[in-house]
C-alpha cells in the first residue's frame, strides 16, 4: 500500500486509568497531513465519537480509561500530499496496585517512570502527563511510599516536584496523581516513578543537540517568504532557552520595528529519552541585506547557523 513503516518502542501502561498517545513523528507531521488510527491491522478506523471509551481525538488516540484487554499493536496512518507513513505502537497493559508491596516492580520501565535525583543538589521530578487539549488536568499531588509528600524541601511547580538539598533518603517509590476531566467525566491519573540517587553532577553535563540547522547556506530567491525550523533535542528536565539571534541580538528585538523577520512559538514533542524542540524563524520577505548574514539558533550552550544565499543564475532560462 506504499506506506513507510515506523515502529514505536513498546509502551507499558497501567490499567484502569486514562492514557493517550499522540501520532507524531517530527519529519512528517509538521506539514498538512491527515492522521487515522487503527487497532491490530484492522481496516476499520478507531472511532472519532468522543463518547467512545477508545477514540481518536485529532492526532491522538485516547483511552478513557485503559483496560487490560486493550493490549496490542495500534497503527496510525499519516497521509501527506506525496507520502504515507504507518506508525506501529505496541501497547502493553498491566494491573498495578501502587501501594501493594507484595507485587513486584513495573516491567521494563521507560525513563519517564525511572528518574534520578542528584545528591546534595536542588533537583526535580517530572510527572509526565501527555493528553490532548480536550482533557483538562487538575493540580498534581505527589506521594512517596504511598504517603502524600509534605515538608519545606518539596515544592510542587506545574508538572514538577522540586526537591531541595537532595538526600539519600529521597530514593524510593513516588507517584504523581492528577484528576483528568473529559466531556464532564472525571478520571484519576496516577503515575508511579522509581527514584534513585546519584552523586554525579547533573546528567553528565548533557548539552542540547541542534539537529537542524547544521551551519550551512540556504539558496532563496529575493522577495520570497522563508520559514526555517531549528530542531533541538535535549534532556526531559532541561532549563535551556532556545531562540534565534542575528548580530548577537534576538531577532524579535533586532527587527522590532519592521517585524519582517520573527521568531515563532516554540513547540516540543516528548520522546522517551528526550524532548525534541522546534522553534522557527520566519522571513516575511527576504531582502538583499539578509544574504550572507549568519542567523543563529541558540539552545543553551549550543549554536548553529544558516546563511541565506542567492541561487546561482540558471543560464538555461536565457
Amino acid at each position: 500500500d506504499g506506506c513507510k513503516d515506523i515502529f514505536m518502542k513498546n509502551e507499558i501502561l497501567s490499567a484502569s486509568q486514562p492514557f493517550a498517545f499522540n501520532c507524531t513523528f517530527p519529519p512528517i507531521t509538521s506539514g498538512e497531513v491527515s492522521v487515522t488510527w487503527y487497532k491490530n491491522s484492522s481496516k476499520i478506523p478507531v472511532s472519532k465519537i468522543i463518547q467512545s471509551r477508545i477514540h481518536q481525538d485529532e492526532t491522538w488516540i485516547l483511552f478513557l480509561p485503559m483496560e487490560w484487554g486493550d493490549s496490542g499493536v495500534y497503527q496510525c496512518v499519516i497521509k501527506g500530499r506525496d507520502s504515507c507513513h504507518r506508525i506501529h505502537v505496541n501497547l502493553t497493559v498491566f494491573e498495578k496496585h501502587w501501594c501493594d508491596t507484595s507485587i513486584g516492580g513495573l516491567p521494563n520501565l521507560s525513563d519517564e517512570y525511572k528518574q534520578i535525583l542528584h545528591l546534595g543538589k536542588d533537583d526535580s521530578l517530572t510527572c509526565h502527563l501527555h493528553f490532548p487539549k480536550s482533557c483538562v488536568l487538575g493540580p498534581i499531588k505527589w506521594y512517596k511510599d504511598c504517603n502524600e509528600i509534605k515538608g519545606e524541601r518539596f515544592t510542587v511547580l506545574e508538572t514538577r516536584l522540586l526537591v531541595s538539598n537532595v538526600s539519600a533518603e529521597d530514593r524510593g517509590n513516588y507517584a504523581c496523581q492528577a484528576i483528568l476531566t473529559h466531556s464532564g467525566k472525571q478520571y484519576e491519573v496516577l503515575n508511579g516513578i522509581t527514584v534513585s540517587i546519584t552523586e554525579r553532577a547533573g546528567y553528565g553535563g548533557s548539552v542540547p543537540k541542534i539537529i537542524y540547522p547544521k551551519n550551512h547556506s540556504i539558496e532563496v530567491q529575493l522577495g520570497t517568504t522563508l520559514i526555517v525550523d531549528c530542531n533541538v533535542t535535549d534532556t526531559k528536565d532541561n532549563t535551556n532557552l532556545r531562540c534565534w539571534r542575528v548580530n548577537n541580538t534576538l531577532v524579535d528585538d533586532y527587527y522590532d520595528e519592521s517585524k519582517r523577520i520573527r521568531e515563532g512559538v516554540e513547540t516540543h514533542v516528548s520522546f522517551r529519552e528526550h524532548n525534541l524542540y522546534t522553534v522557527n524563524i520566519t522571513f516575511l520577505e527576504v531582502k538583499m541585506e539578509d544574504y550572507g548574514l549568519p542567523f543563529m539558533c541558540h539552545a543553551g550552550v549550543s549554536t548553529a547557523y544558516i546563511i541565506l544565499q542567492l541561487p546561482a543564475p540558471d543560464f538555461r532560462a536565457y
Epitope: G2, C3, K4, D5, I6, F7, M8, K9, F25, P26, P27, I28, G80, D82, S83, I87, I211, T233, F271, R272, E273, H274, L276
Partner: antibody, heavy 125, light 107 residues
Amino acid sequence: EVQLQQSGPELVKPGASVKLSCKASGYTFTDNYMNWVRQSHGKSLEWIGRVNPSNGDTKYNQNFKGKATLTVDKSLSTAYMQLNGLTSEDSAVYYCGRTKNFYSSYSYDDAMDYWGQGTSVTVSS
Amino acid sequence: DIQMTQSPASQSASLGESVTFTCLASQTIGTWLAWYQQRPGKSPQLLIYAATSLADGVPSRFSGSGSGTQFSFNIRSLQAEDFASYYCQQVYTTPLTFGGGTKLEIK
C-alpha cells in the same frame, strides 16, 4: 566514536557457506538497525536486508531470501550475515551499515550513517 | 520495488567547478532519500539524508534538493577529494534501493 569493524576477506569454494561479522562500538548497539549491502566489482550497491538488534527481527530483500541469514549477538555487540550456497555470482564486497536514527523512541529504515570497511568474498574452485 | 534512476552515469569536471546529479524514483518517496560518496576501495560515506539535510562533518559545498520523485545533488567549487562515485538511495520502503551511481572524474 562510532565504529563498525568487519571480519577479514574470505576465499570459499562454490556451494559452501560463509559467516561474516560486524562488531559495533561507540554507541548502544540495540538502538539502531544494522543493514547489509553487497557491491559486486565495478557495480552499484544492493541492499541485502537489515536486523533489529534489540529483538532480532529481520527484513530481507526478496532477491537474497534463502541466500542470506542475518543474526546478532547482543552481548558481543556484533551482527552476523551467513551466506549459503555460494556461487561465483556472490563474489563481491559486503558492507554492514548502521541506520541513522534521530528519534530514539522509534525504529525505522533510514540512511546509513556509519559503514564497516567491507569484507571481500571470493567464490572460486 | 522502487527503482532509482541516477544520471549522468559519469561526468568530467574541473577543480573549482560546480556539478549537479539527478535521481528519479519510480514512485513517490517524500523526502526519504540519501546521497553517498564512495572513493575507490573505500566504504560509502553518507553526505545527505532526508533529501536536503547535511550529515555531520560534511562540508557545506554539498547540497541536496527535491521531494516526491525528483531529486538533485549539487557540489559547488569542486575539490580534488570530491572526485569519486556518488549514489542515491531511497529509504522510504523496503527493499531499500540504490541508484546506479554517478562517477565523477577529473577533466
